[in-house]
């Protein structure tokens, strides 16, 4: 058993039929010695008396809020949560496996630049009685500070018969050095509590591996005289690291017809303009990627050819 926060404790249980469970001793936080009784949750049934209460925790019915009283007055509370271990593996019931980039991916993280700010998100089908706490650091043995905010419900989607909820959190490395070579990964730890169930999830990454630039901005077309060609121009996204001479992007320019089956023309360039042929009813899209490190491409920025 360990303390998650003040008066909230996690009991770690091997979860199998007829498991013996864990013996837990609760102590009433009071100078009083006599006339103390214990109850669980909203029940008025007295579980025991005395300054300490010994219980055998085997299942969720044994978890909950234990309260010690004296003469009708509440003295203190202790909330017991359960963390299940089945076949040697901690349960992952609360979050959904996103299966990308690989199985057992519960947390996904992205950064728009090298500033040390990143966003992580996760999915669940649970709508209520759910809370999260997020901690992060660079490295684990001698951790350097990363500040994370509160988890926020960022999207709700309908997936077939189920509703899916996306939570996200923003974090900022306290003393980030954008130009430095990373040697220690960022560690992200999410504590999840649903009703009386506790779970934790972790992710480890280098900022360089989770970079995904915003799409190029100010995408414009300039027709070239007496030609079907157009000059496409764009700018670096505002959120990208500066100076651009050091933090450089490469771009992919795509001409796509109305039909998905039509051939796509693609041009790759390090410049912020390109000359392409504009077909009728086609659209021109541009996306960006770090020029020197193959992390994710940005989403497309698009304009119609007309």
């Amino acid at each position: 058993i360990w303390e998650l926060k003040k008066d909230v404790y996690v009991v770690e249980l091997d979860w199998y039929p007829d498991a013996p469970g864990e013996m837990v001793v609760l102590t009433c936080d009071t100078p009083e010695e006599d006339g103390i009784t214990w109850t669980l949750d909203q029940s008025s049934e007295v579980l025991g008396s005395g300054k300490t209460l010994t219980i055998q925790v085997k299942e969720f019915g044994d978890a909950g809020q234990y309260t010690c009283h004296k003469g009708g007055e509440v003295l203190s509370h202790s909330l017991l949560l359960l963390h299940k271990k089945e076949d040697g593996i901690w349960s992952t019931d609360i979050l959904k496996d996103q299966k990308e980039p690989k199985n057992k991916t519960f947390l996904r993280c992205e950064a728009k630049n090298y500033s040390g700010r990143f966003t992580c998100w996760w999915l669940t089908t649970i709508s209520t009685d759910l809370t999260f706490s997020v901690k992060s650091s660079r490295g684990s043995s001698d951790p350097q500070g990363v500040t994370c905010g509160a988890a926020t419900l960022s999207a709700e989607r309908v997936r077939g018969d189920n509703k899916e909820y996306e939570y996200s959190v923003e974090c900022q490395e306290d003393s980030a050095c954008p130009a430095a070579e990373e040697s220690l990964p960022i560690e992200v730890m999410v504590d999840a509590v649903h009703k009386l169930k506790y779970e934790n999830y972790t992710s480890s990454f280098f900022i360089r591996d989770i970079i995904k630039p915003d799409p190029p901005k100010n995408l414009q077309l300039k027709p070239l005289k007496n030609s079907r060609q157009v000059e496409v121009s764009w700018e670096y996204p505002d959120t990208w690291s500066t100076p651009h001479s050091y933090f450089s992007l490469t771009f992919c320019v795509q001409v796509q017809g109305k039909s998905k089956r039509e051939k796509k023309d693609r041009v790759f360039t390090d410049k912020t303009s390109a000359t392409v042929i504009c077909r009728k009813n086609a659209s021109i899209s541009v996306r960006a990627q770090d020029r020197y490190y193959s992390s994710s491409w940005s989403e497309w920025a698009s304009v119609p050819c007309s």
């Epitope: 998650l4 926060k5 003040k6 008066d7 909230v8 909950g64 809020q65 509370h77 202790s78 909330l79 209520t128 009685d129 759910l130 809370t131 999260f132 706490s133 509160a150 988890a151 926020t152 419900l153 960022s154 999207a155 709700e156 939570y167 996200s168 504590d191 509590v193 649903h194 009703k195 009386l196």
Partner: nanobody, 122 residues
Framework: EVQLVESGGGLVQPGGSLRLSCAAS????????MGWYRQAPGKQRELVAG??????NYADSVKGRFTISRDGAKNTVYLQMNSLKPEDTAVYYC?????????????????WGQGTLVTVSS
Amino acid sequence: EVQLVESGGGLVQPGGSLRLSCAASGSFFSIKSMGWYRQAPGKQRELVAGIASGVTNYADSVKGRFTISRDGAKNTVYLQMNSLKPEDTAVYYCNAVGERLANTGVTEYDYWGQGTLVTVSS
């Protein structure tokens, strides 16, 4: 407990700008929505702007003039108020709705800041 602390109110001339901030603090809490409400003397409290599930919404009277935004790493929500009018004079309250873990279990919360006065007058 989740605490909300507002700042940024004050006296401004018509056409001027102000930026309100609201910082949420606490432990083990998840935010479902954050927003700004206002209450003018003798009137009902009304929603000015809110962010929920990643979507922003605004009262018709402030659309195009006010912008709500969040800094998630700092648990802070902002209200940038431009082109202020005398009818924007009110006490502005920050609101946060979500769930938190207490020793009673996971419970919903609906917290309000103490309010910050915005006066638009020449």
